[in-house]
Amino acid sequence: GELETSDVVTVVLGQDAKLPCFYRGDSGEQVGQVAWARVDAGEGAQELALLHSKYGLHVSPAYEGRVEQPPPPRNPLDGSVLLRNAVQADEGEYECRVSTFPAGSFQARLRLRVLVPPLPSLNPGPALEEGQGLTLAASCTAEGSPAPSVTWDTEVKGTTSSRSFKHSRSAAVTSEFHLVPSRSMNGQPLTCVVSHPGLLQDQRITHILHVSFLAEASVRGLEDQNLWHIGREGAMLKCLSEGQPPPSYNWTRLDGPLPSGVRVDGDTLGFPPLTTEHSGIYVCHVSNEFSSRDSQVTVDVLDPQEDSGKQVDLVSAS
């Protein structure tokens, strides 16, 4: 007869491991007992369990409640055992020693490999601001056994760097994603992808990029200066900018307070029917946590009675 087992049994942390040991004997041969021991190099054999044809299953105190025989029906030549709820410390070499009649004793070894799936974590880097150089966007760390693979999935252009720390029974892998921040990256997904043999599918953690910026400010509404004449209704100036975080707008008049009747509505300055007192220099002040910008325009309300139109100056400053 001969013993049938596996060279390696692989199980995921927390699952039950079946340690196979089957005696394929000639007809009339009987298995008296099967002794299972852990036999890691440099250490003596440590009892796991004893399956006896008459006495039944004996489990070592160290494995009490964790070793069982496979559910019935059981072949009397099958000395396999189940190791419940495998933990990392169970990883190692195991031996089954089979006593048969009349053929004598046989033994076989197998290696139990316990896969520890990673629980990845993604940590965003410092706040991203347009104008910075190469900056850490995010780091992703995953620890497992064996070492997991950590990669990035994104449309954003950047560079990656990885480092690994080996522990006694596992390895932690950290990958960093660096980029040169630009406003076009705003709202773009940056996904950490972790692969491991203990995972049914890759684990993905997505981080949405936020790049702080503030665009130059400009004022719209004075494109046709001939429309700015006494008596015109619905005249308005609109301040144009964009930013992250979204900016706030403030209107002032450089040469005095805003005339009465002028309404400020965020980025828009609304005028009542125009009079000459509405002529002046208006300043749009745009700001967010990242920066601030100004744009000023000169409004000159025309008197249709006068022959010649007035010149309108647009000045932008930041």
């Epitope: 007992q33 002794a35 021991a37 009892e47 004893l50 006896h52 008459k54 006495y55 039944g56 299953l57 004996h58 070592s60 105190p61 020693r97």
Partner: antibody, heavy 123, light 107 residues
Framework: EVQLVESGGGLVQPGGSLRLSCAAS????????MSWVRQAPGKGLEWVSR????????HYADSVKGRFTISRDNSKNTLYLQMNSLRAEDTAVYYC????????????????WGQGTLVTVSS | DIQMTQSPSSLSASVGDRVTITCRAS??????LAWYQQKPGKAPKLLIY???SLQSGVPSRFSGSGSGTDFTLTISSLQPEDFATYYC?????????FGQGTKVEIK
């Protein structure tokens, strides 16, 4: 025929010592785990100690730990129990018994017993 | 340590009676249970090993059953030579422990 014959019992004062012997014959002594079991007058059976056949490692009941020592001489097919610091509660018939080692520290039932030797601890 | 609880502690029966003695272990011991018979002034004699296996030379009127924690010794038809004290013993763990014994007396 398997035979186990105990000797060495007798009357001893509290605090005294005694050495029991168990002569084995009719089987391969060195292949078996050997135990001492005692029975106080009118009481039940109490396991005392056991010695392993493979490496001579020993186990003791808490009640005798540190006072009793089990040993064996495979060349003489003899089991011993050295009893020191004897107490009145050690008074009992002492039996030696054999059991087959299955594996590790797992044994069969004790299939053969000696006739016993009486130890009396009294002043 | 595993506690072995035997019941009854004594019983009276007549020749030809069916006698049942039970033994309960404080935790599972598979079939690592033996039954012994002891007569006054004599050494214990192994009757049943592995909970239900009859030791060689023991009459077939003796039988054992059970597994795990609950075990039974049955004498199908009590004979005059069966009046004795019976002990169960677990040898699943060290220390092996005995039940307190059941004395079978003549009614």
């Amino acid at each position: 025929e398997v035979q186990l014959v105990e000797s060495g019992g007798g009357l001893v004062q509290p605090g005294g010592s005694l050495r029991l012997s168990c002569a084995a014959s009719g089987f391969n002594f060195s292949n078996y785990g050997m135990s001492w079991v005692r029975q106080a007058p009118g009481k039940g059976l109490e396991w005392v100690s056991r010695i392993k056949p493979t490496d001579g490692s020993t186990h003791y009941a808490d009640s005798v730990k540190g006072r009793f020592t089990i040993s064996r001489d495979n060349s003489k097919n003899t089991l011993y129990l050295q009893m020191n610091s004897l107490r009145a509660e050690d008074t009992a018939v002492y039996y030696c018994a054999r059991a087959e080692l299955l594996a590790f520290d797992v044994y069969t039932a004790s299939d053969y017993w000696g006739q016993g030797t009486l130890v009396t601890v009294s002043s | 340590d595993i506690q072995m609880t035997q019941s009854p502690s004594s019983l009276s029966a007549s020749v030809g009676d069916r006698v049942t003695i039970t033994c309960r272990a404080s935790q599972g011991i598979s079939s690592y249970l033996a039954w012994y018979q002891q007569k006054p002034g004599k050494a214990p004699k192994l009757l049943i090993y592995a909970a239900s296996s009859l030791q060689s030379g023991v009459p077939s009127r003796f039988s054992g059953s059970g597994s795990g924690t609950d075990f039974t010794l049955t004498i199908s038809s009590l004979q005059p030579e069966d009046f004795a004290t019976y002990y169960c013993q677990q040898h699943y763990t060290t220390p092996p422990t005995f039940g307190q014994g059941t004395k079978v007396e003549i009614k």
